[in-house]
Interface confidence: low
């Protein structure tokens, strides 16, 4: 349905509060280095303009596209060239090239200081003094650090952020009330950002067919009672929503997401029995709830898949008539029967099935050729099952920190060219799979673990794309989305790698170690561990364990000393010398 003024249409649909929030997020995700005040000024100008268009859709410039309006506004920033360098060249382009240019300059690892949490009283005062500015600042700070954050979901986070302050700033013990809520929001926010980044990578690097396949598998697991046609409709709508958000079309994305939530709630009977409690909630909460809804129960009497997909003589005819629909139906049928499989495994099975049909439908006896296709699935299923089993055993044996260290060593040996901060970040997150998934019942472990690992490995791929240093990483990241995790799992010690020269400064520690939080201490130690492996890639587990145990003892000793700095100065070189000897 066409509108004379797109900006007026979206303003009326979304309402002023959501409109302003989404425009602020959009601008902050594009111009990540701009000061807060500059963005607020731009947002206010766009909002005032939108109001004039609501009053009169025929007013000057109201017929322009949102990309044109927003792009023109971004290009008025005076310091664009100094702050963003070549991104300023985008402004010389016409739409749609200009928006594509802005998108290409989004920085997944912006050089921004980590967010420091002020004292609770300071935050509560700021919240009470100017609630609107306080919440805008939250949107701005998160959006500029996470340029692909799912914008309508970020509005939901902001609403929870506001609720936390409104409740806790009145509490007797403000800190006890507020800090756990902020920790939860931070952790959930990081997870949400990473999940969305994978969706955008899937769409941008592998196309909407890849995203649709992912969505068919996931929605079929969630809604096993829904018909294939119903799942297909949801997949089409969901693909549109995420394509828009990943493309920077945040107003359209939020509007379409609201429409999708409305549709799902109006058609619960044909989708899932689990939607009811979501549908009673207000919009932002409702959309979030629907996205996170648990899997519905599987219908009791689902027939064997073999009849339609192996035993039938019409397999090749059905495949030839409409390949994508036939494969989509296969994926739907397989996924709704297997909530215990990861989405990535289901996609590998569909890919294997497609490859078998491509080969067999051209053979002399197609039926004979594809008769054993399900047997070929067995090794594909067993590989992630075994991986989860082994890694959960290791996690239970070692605990999270040492499990992370085992992964740090494993991944540094695989891809030692990758920067140390990236290896530490990625391995620490890979290690969190243990606490997240290993405590779950058997039937939920694989979907939890492998789909989480896909999200974490996508972060590695995204960071590596910015500064490529390893052909092996490039290969695993670009060849196949569904095989990324098996590709990384299969990597061995890089024999071609020339060990990094020993640099004593890397292993120089100071008294400030003692005042760090437990997490910061772990990161310091893990950074040293990566550097050790880069220096001695063939070091054994035992050797590395010995060095790390000595390191922990050395830090503990010096942190107990009266003159900590002197202790680090005197014991540090001894630790370095002993470590070099132990690894010689």
């Amino acid at each position: 349905d066409t509108h004379k003024s797109e900006v007026a249409h979206r303003f009326k649909d979304l309402g002023e509060e959501h409109f302003k929030g989404l425009v602020l997020v959009a601008f902050s995700q594009y111009l990540q280095q701009c000061p807060f005040e500059e963005h607020v000024k731009l947002v206010n100008e766009v909002t005032e303009f939108a109001k004039t268009c609501v009053a009169d859709e025929s007013a000057e410039n109201c017929d322009k596209s949102l990309h044109t309006l927003f792009g023109d506004k971004l290009c008025t920033v005076a310091t664009l060239r100094e702050t963003y360098g070549e991104m300023a060249d985008c402004c010389a382009k016409q739409e749609p090239e200009r928006n594509e240019c802005f998108l290409q300059h989004k920085d997944d690892n912006p050089n921004l200081p980590p967010l420091v949490r002020p004292e609770v009283d300071v935050m509560c005062t700021a919240f009470h003094d100017n609630e609107a500015t306080f919440l805008k600042k939250y949107l701005y700070e998160v959006a500029r650090r996470h340029p692909y954050f799912y914008a309508p979901e970020l509005l939901f986070f902001a609403a929870r952020y506001k609720a936390a302050f409104a409740e806790c700033c009145q509490a007797a013990d403000k800190a006890a009330c507020l800090l756990p809520k902020l920790d939860e929001l931070r952790d959930e926010g990081k997870a949400s950002s990473a999940k969305q980044r994978l969706k955008c990578a899937s769409l941008q690097k592998f196309g909407d067919r890849a995203f649709k396949a992912w969505a068919v598998a996931r929605l079929s697991q969630k809604f096993p009672k829904a018909e294939f046609a119903e799942v297909s409709k949801l997949v089409t709508d969901l693909t549109k929503v995420h394509t828009e958000c990943c493309h920077g079309d945040l107003l359209e994305c939020a509007d379409d997401r609201a429409d999708l939530a409305k549709y799902m709630c109006e058609n619960q009977d044909s989708i899932s029995s689990k939607l009811k409690e979501c549908c009673d909630k207000p919009l932002l909460e409702k959309s979030h709830c629907l996205a996170e809804v648990e899997n519905d129960e599987m219908p009791a009497d689902l027939p064997s898949l073999a009849a339609d997909y192996v035993e039938s003589k019409d397999v090749c005819k059905n495949y030839a008539e409409a390949k994508d629909v036939f494969l989509g139906m296969f994926l739907y049928e397989y996924a709704r029967r297997h909530p215990d499989y990861s989405v990535m495994l289901l996609l590998r099975l569909a890919k294997a099935y497609e490859a078998t049909l491509e080969k067999c439908c051209a053979a002399a006896d197609p039926h004979e050729c594809y008769a054993k296709v399900f047997d070929e699935f067995q090794p594909l299923v067993e590989e992630p099952q075994n991986l989860v089993k082994q890694n959960c055993e290791l996690f239970e044996q070692l605990g999270e920190y040492k499990f992370q260290n085992a992964l740090l060593v494993r991944y540094t040996k695989k891809v030692p060219q990758v920067s140390t901060p990236t290896l530490v970040e990625v391995s620490r997150n890979l290690g969190k799979v243990g606490a997240k998934c290993c405590k779950l019942p058997e039937a939920k472990r694989m979907p939890c673990a492998e789909d989480y690992l896909s999200v974490v490995l996508n972060r590695l791929c995204v960071l590596h794309e910015k500064t490529p240093v390893s052909e092996k990483v490039t290969k695993c990241c670009t060849e196949s989305l569904v095989n990324r995790r098996p590709c990384f799992s299969a990597l061995e010690l890089d024999e071609a790698y020339v060990p990094k020269a020993f640099n004593a400064e890397t292993f120089t520690f100071h008294a400030d170690m003692c005042t760090l939080s437990e997490k910061e201490k772990q990161v310091k130690k893990q950074t040293a561990l990566v550097e050790l492996v880069k220096h001695k890639p063939k070091a054994t587990k035992e050797q590395l364990k010995g060095v790390m145990d000595n390191f922990a003892a050395f830090v503990e000793k010096c942190c107990k000393a009266d003159d900590k700095e002197a202790c680090f100065a005197e014991e540090g070189p001894k630790f370095v010398a002993a470590s070099q000897a132990a690894l010689a």
Epitope: A504, E505, T508, F568, A569, E570, P573
Partner: nanobody, 116 residues
Framework: AVQLVDSGGGLVQPGGSLRLSCAAS????????MSWVRQYPGKEPEWVSS????????RYADSVKGRFSISRDNAKNTLYLQMNSLKPEDTAEYYC?????????RTQGTQVTVSS
């Protein structure tokens, strides 16, 4: 060959000042952290202060904090130690080292005596 030549020591009254220098050669000076160490007769060497390769991170033993200042000139391949408010207990032989090691290597050291 790596060489470190210390200079600037001498006799000074309590409360006085001295500036020690360490001229380095034979290695990429700007790539290495450097330290000053002192040794009392018959005692183990004691770390005094360190500075990183770029010169933007300095560290001090508690006993000299606020009185001594370490710096470097990478263009001149030279390390310095500005010593103010000197006390009798600062009397020792001072020498520079590469990195954070307190073990003396390839350096003669320079004697500092604080006495009235």
């Amino acid at each position: 060959a790596v060489q470190l030549v210390d200079s600037g020591g001498g006799l000074v009254q309590p409360g006085g000042s001295l500036r020690l220098s360490c001229a380095a050669s034979g290695f990429s000076f700007g790539s290495f952290g450097m330290s000053w160490v002192r040794q009392y007769p018959g005692k183990e060497p004691e770390w005094v202060s360190s500075i990183n390769g770029r010169g933007d991170d300095t560290r001090y033993a508690d006993s000299v904090k606020g009185r001594f200042s370490i710096s470097r000139d990478n263009a001149k391949n030279t390390l310095y130690l500005q010593m103010n408010s000197l006390k009798p207990e600062d009397t020792a032989e001072y020498y520079c080292t590469i990195g954070r090691s307190v073990s003396r290597s390839r350096t003669q050291g320079t004697q500092v005596t604080v006495s009235s």
